[in-house]
Interface confidence: low
Amino acid sequence: QGNRWRRSKRASYVSNPICKGCLSCSKDNGCSRCQQKLFFFLRREGMRQYGECLHSCPSGYYGHRAPDMNRCARCRIENCDSCFSKDFCTKCKVGFYLHRGRCFDECPDGFAPLEETMECVEGCEVGHWSEWGTCSRNNRTCGFKWGLETRTRQIVKKPAKDTIPCPTIAESRRCKMAMRHCPGGKRTPKAKEKRNKKKKRKLIERAQEQHSVFLATDRANQ
């Protein structure tokens, strides 16, 4: 059935609208030369190809102007749906973001995805990460087995749109403390806790004593 259709299609080629805009048209290959300003496009059928002359190239192709003949050339940009030239994409495939004529599954650093247009727009510009800080906890570098180390980066430029969030400017990770026990009798958390309880008890006792003195003085004055 496919071959019958192919034969009948080829037989009526010269009168077929496919020859529109051709300078030369054959029953075997369709157009081989186009009128000025039209683009030559090869349409495939089985493993035979047919030439057509088009005002604009189909999706996935761009118009390449050349002295001998203008032709439709394939967009060779990865994940591109339509392009303006050999290396400049104008519309990406679904799920990809357009950025400077290329298609990305994630916007490059410094750019943020604008979902409504599927483009990468200038995002919140941040500086380089600082070195990881000292491993510490509660501002102490000892007395714990595990601590946290932090690194930061500065916001260099605020985003163009308020809806675009800035990336994280501080991050922490768990780290092993250099010293589990503090030198020079510095107390571990448990010892500190005991000391605090003792201090609290003394304060309560002192407060009670002062209150008794106050009551006694008050009675004497009456």
């Epitope: 192919r6 075997d28 081989s32 030369r33 090869l42 089985g46 493993m47 001998d68």
Partner: antibody, heavy 119, light 110 residues
Framework: EVQLVESGGGLVKPEGSLKLSCVAS????????MSWVRQAPGQGLEWVAH??????????YYSGSVKGRFSISRDDSRNMVYLQMNNLRTEDTATYYC??????????WGQGTQVTVSS | QPVLTQSPSVSASLGASVKLTCTLS???????IEWYQQHPDKSPKFLMQ??????SKGDGTPDRFSGSSSGAHRYLSISNLQLEDEAIYYC?????????FGSGTQLTLL
């Protein structure tokens, strides 16, 4: 940059089987027709098999010399094209090239993988 | 009669010009053809597609290479021959369900 890397070649006995693989990168693989072309030692080029894209229901074509013995397939999720070769003959000894065939000719070629069929 | 006929070898001098011929059989005389270049122990490389009176070059094909046609003949012309042009040149064409290559022409530089 378009890259095609073939693998799976080797020495096999007549009537044996071998599966060649080709991994593609640098272009949207699922959009492109793919072919295998071979070259016997000191000989010319011979087109072997061709596979269309999903749009064309992965239609396949084979040269007369391999029809019924070889099978071309593709895995778009892995950017791979395969050539399953069964009932191999000594005349199948060749370097097998993986090629892109989207622009209606073999515009990009891999480095090739050697297949030797010998007892 | 083979579908594509190429002369086995052609010799030319460095800096000169050469014209390689690929002749199509009568039933394919209106077809487009392609030219490929292959250096020893290297993969073939697509050079161009030749149509009636025009050609489309592949990426990286030098301007020194051009294609033309006359009747059933398709030509590959190379001007200002360079050492790197010494190679085998194949022509090829696609038909309804197969692709055919010529036997190749060995270009040797003198």
């Amino acid at each position: 940059e378009v890259q095609l890397v073939e693998s799976g070649g080797g020495l096999v006995k007549p009537e044996g089987s071998l599966k060649l693989s080709c991994v593609a990168s640098g272009f949207t693989f699922s959009d492109y027709f793919m072919s295998w072309v071979r070259q016997a030692p000191g000989q010319g080029l011979e087109w072997v098999a061709h596979i269309y894209t999903k749009t064309y229901n992965y239609a396949t074509y084979y040269s007369g010399s391999v029809k019924g013995r070889f099978s071309i397939s593709r895995d778009d999720s892995r950017n791979m094209v395969y050539l399953q070769m069964n009932n191999l003959r000594t005349e199948d000894t060749a370097t097998y090239y993986c090629t892109t065939d989207e622009d209606w000719y073999f515009d990009f070629w891999g480095q090739g993988t050697q297949v030797t069929v010998s007892s | 009669q083979p579908v594509l006929t190429q002369s086995p070898s052609v010799s030319a001098s460095l800096g000169a010009s050469v014209k390689l011929t690929c002749t199509l059989s009568s039933q394919h005389s209106t077809n487009y053809i392609e030219w490929y270049q292959q250096h020893p122990d290297k993969s073939p490389k697509f050079l161009m597609q030749v149509r009636d009176g025009s050609h489309s070059k592949g990426d990286g094909t030098p301007d020194r290479f051009s294609g033309s046609s006359s009747g059933a003949h398709r030509y590959l012309s190379i001007s200002n021959l360079q050492l790197e042009d010494e190679a085998i040149y194949y022509c090829g064409l696609s038909d309804v369900s197969l692709y055919l290559f010529g036997s190749g022409t060995q270009l040797t530089l003198l």
